[in-house]
Amino acid sequence: CKAMHVAQPAVVLASSRGIASFVCEYASPGKATEVRVTVLRQADSQVTEVCAATYMMGNELTFLDDSICTGTSSGNQVNLTIQGLRAMDTGLYICKVELMYPPPYYLGIGNGTQIYVIDPEPCPDSDF
């Protein structure tokens, strides 16, 4: 089958600080030296890009400074962390992997990770 398989967990619960982490693993059909990883959010039929990073195999994964994502890579596995999440950000987050170089190009799309975010209860005022 001329395709790239991408695996990611089905469900992740964000921490009380609005941080969610998950592993995105891909089975590379070729020996890529340049890989692009994108996190997409799917709401209804709309798909939007959350963050993206390109890395050279063996080097570290670097997102833009203003990105809400951070990550590390090890072989064909990427550990992704999304920060600053609120309850309204609950949804399906898809890991997309592209083998950019050398040819041929391959596209891999995971089934998505449902991230649940619960806003923390505000601390009650204390009376002394």
């Epitope: 089958c1 001329k2 395709a3 790239m4 398989h5 059909p29 340049e34 692009r36 994108t38 997409l40 798909v47 939007t48 890009e49 993206a52 390109t54 898809i94 997309k96 592209e98 950019m100 170089y101 040819p103 041929p104 190009y105 391959y106 596209l107 799309i109």
Partner: antibody
Framework: QVQLVESGGGVVQPGRSLRLSCAAS????????MHWVRQAPGKGLEWVAV????????YYADSVKGRFTISRDNSKNTLDLQMNSLRAEDTAVYYC???????????WGQGTLVTVSS | EIVLTQSPGTLSLSPGERATLSCRAS???????LAWYQQKPGQAPRLLIY???SRATGIPDRFSGSGSGTDFTLTISRLEPEDFAVYYC?????????FGQGTKVEIK
């Protein structure tokens, strides 16, 4: 709204060159791969070339490799196709198309006709 | 290169009838990377279905896609006058991007 508008088509003699452009608007251009697809008169669709994101990675169909060059200017939201050593079989309507996040081509321009004839 | 073969070449049907279009791949492909497009004369192609079965934005639910492996199908449940056009399948999971040769749905 997303808009793609091609220009630069026309009649050209075999062996000559032509440059097509595609002006994009209504979306963050640098976040998308962009393709050229062509359609010879009365025929089906043929993928020609793609350029990714920052413009470093490009792929071409075997039929145009070494003759066509795809490029983009993210500051101007434009996509170009430089076509050299044109042949009669390059006669077609050329479309630019946006690569949607999940991989298919979700928006297309109206097309520009290139006729290679002596 | 993945070769896509569409059948039939031409489908002659009446409005209100059901249309079933086939797309066969030369080797197994993931359903995540199979799309269908509609093209009317003098117009650009329009994305109908991606991921073999997901309808693109604004596409009516009379259009549906299915299939896996090497065999994929586009079904139009009840043909409307505006559905008479040429339909193309496409594989986009790896380079080169390929299209089928098209199926023309014409009025009987």
């Amino acid at each position: 709204q997303v808009q793609l508008v091609e220009s630069g088509g026309g009649v050209v003699q075999p062996g000559r060159s032509l440059r097509l452009s595609c002006a994009a608007s209504g979306f963050t251009f640098s976040s998308y791969g962009m393709h050229w697809v062509r359609q010879a008169p009365g025929k089906g669709l043929e993928w020609v070339a793609v350029i990714w994101y920052d413009g470093r990675n490009k792929y071409y169909a075997d039929s145009v490799k070494g003759r066509f060059t795809i490029s983009r200017d993210n500051s101007k939201n434009t996509l170009d196709l430089q076509m050299n050593s044109l042949r009669a079989e390059d006669t077609a309507v050329y479309y630019c198309a946006r690569n949607q996040p999940l991989g298919s081509f979700d928006y297309w321009g109206q097309g520009t006709l290139v006729t290679v004839s002596s | 290169e993945i070769v896509l073969t569409q059948s039939p070449g031409t489908l002659s049907l009446s409005p209100g009838e059901r249309a079933t279009l086939s797309c066969r791949a030369s080797q197994s492909v993931s359903s995540s990377y199979l799309a269908w497009y509609q093209q009317k004369p003098g117009q650009a192609p329009r994305l109908l279905i991606y991921g073999a079965s997901s309808r693109a934005t604004g596409i009516p639910d009379r259009f549906s896609g299915s299939g896996s492996g090497t065999d994929f199908t586009l079904t139009i449940s009840r043909l409307e006058p505006e559905d008479f056009a040429v339909y193309y399948c496409q594989h986009y999971g790896s380079s080169p991007w390929t299209f089928g040769q098209g199926t023309k749905v014409e009025i009987k």
